[in-house]
């Protein structure tokens, strides 16, 4: 079965896509849609996907949503939430993307790809 460790080049691609989103943001990202905040300390890929999958009709993050699927071993559907969700806390998609970017950059620098 596949290695549970994402190749560094693949993680770099994901980071670059998040950078593109934050740099190219003009109007409020996804019309200011709100998503569940997540615990970034573990299982970040599936948790991020479970949160972002609930945003529909936002072309700006479609590639990110799709990329995250390659880092999560199971199928994720809208309305599915893991225990990694920060209880009752929602933030704007733009902030979620920024927080995720900071965390993934940290993981990349430290060579932690899981």
């Amino acid at each position: 079965s596949p290695s549970p460790v994402p190749p560094s080049t693949a993680l770099k691609e994901l980071i670059e896509e998040l950078v593109n989103i934050t740099q190219n943001q003009k109007a409020p990202l996804c019309n200011g849609s709100m998503v569940w905040s997540i615990n970034l300390t573990a299982g970040v890929y599936c948790a991020a996907l479970e949160s972002l999958i609930n945003v529909s009709g936002c072309s700006a993050i479609e590639k990110t949503q799709r990329m995250l699927n390659g880092f999560c071993p199971h199928k994720v559907s809208a309305g599915q939430f893991s225990s990694l969700r920060v209880r009752d806390t929602k933030i704007e998609v733009a902030q979620f993307v920024k927080d995720l970017l900071v965390h993934l950059k940290k993981l990349f620098r430290e060579g932690q790809f899981n």
Epitope: P7, T9, A10, M67, F71, K75
Partner: antibody, heavy 123, light 107 residues
Framework: EVQLLESGGGLVQPGGSLRLSCAAS????????MSWVRQAPGKGLEWVSA????????YYADSVKGRFTISRDNSKNTLYLQMNSLRAEDTAVYYC????????????????WGQGTTVTVSS | SYELTQPPSVSVSPGQTASITCSGD??????ACWFQQKPGQSPVLVIY???KRPSGIPERFSGSNSGDTATLTISGTQAMDEADYYC?????????FGTGTKVTVLG
């Protein structure tokens, strides 16, 4: 623009060997898994083999296991399929496909297909 | 081994809706993709992740997947939609393609 160009097809006798190549451009080749998919004349699509990105895992259809070997050279942006002990039923158009990103690439979707190269196994 | 079964053919009048089914054991637990292939051409991804459309694919293509069945729906079918369609999923370290459905646009 993402492009995949297959080569190496041709006519070969049963029991013979052939090596297919796929030159990729327009994307970070090493980040993506790649697959070979074939289509026999007048038949449907059949997945043959996959090679994950930098992770290095390989996967094969039961019909080719032990006879075909998939490999890649990330420095040359090239995917290969070494086909040995060829049979008449291996006759098909072989497509090189850009597969998914990450360790669970199969959750992504086969985005880009080459134009295909024809392999004919006949005496 | 895992199998995905599709109807061999579907006929539809221009402007009408064509539905193609893909059946497999607990297919709804997996991601389903759909490919369109026209004669002499390479396949094109039209639906991924059950219901997502890649950029450039018309809105008339939609997909769903639950239980044992994934469905590709073509609304307002056009003559250019006449082609073979294949579903696909991943199971036990292998990709599996459906048997294929030939969509014929009448008239």
């Amino acid at each position: 623009e993402v492009q995949l160009l297959e080569s190496g097809g041709g006519l070969v006798q049963p029991g013979g060997s052939l090596r297919l190549s796929c030159a990729a451009s327009g994307f970070t080749f090493s980040s993506y898994a790649m697959s070979w998919v074939r289509q026999a004349p007048g038949k449907g699509l059949e997945w043959v083999s996959a090679f994950s990105g930098s992770g290095g895992s390989t996967y094969y259809a039961d019909s080719v296991k032990g006879r075909f070997t998939i490999s890649r050279d990330n420095s040359k942006n090239t995917l290969y399929l070494q086909m040995n002990s060829l049979r008449a039923e291996d006759t098909a158009v072989y497509y090189c496909v850009q597969d998914g990103l990450g360790p669970y690439f199969y959750n992504y979707g086969m985005d880009v297909w080459g134009q295909g190269t024809t392999v004919t196994v006949s005496s | 081994s895992y199998e995905l079964t599709q109807p061999p053919s579907v006929s539809v009048s221009p402007g009408q809706t064509a539905s193609i089914t893909c059946s497999g054991d607990k297919l709804g637990d997996k991601y389903a993709c759909w490919f369109q292939q026209k004669p002499g051409q390479s396949p094109v991804l039209v639906i991924y992740h059950d219901s997502k459309r890649p950029s450039g694919i018309p809105e008339r293509f939609s997909g769903s997947n639950s239980g044992d069945t994934a469905t590709l729906t073509i609304s307002g079918t056009q003559a250019m939609d006449e082609a073979d369609y294949y579903c696909q999923a991943w199971d036990s370290s292998t990709y599996v393609f459906g048997t294929g459905t030939k969509v014929t646009v009448l008239g």
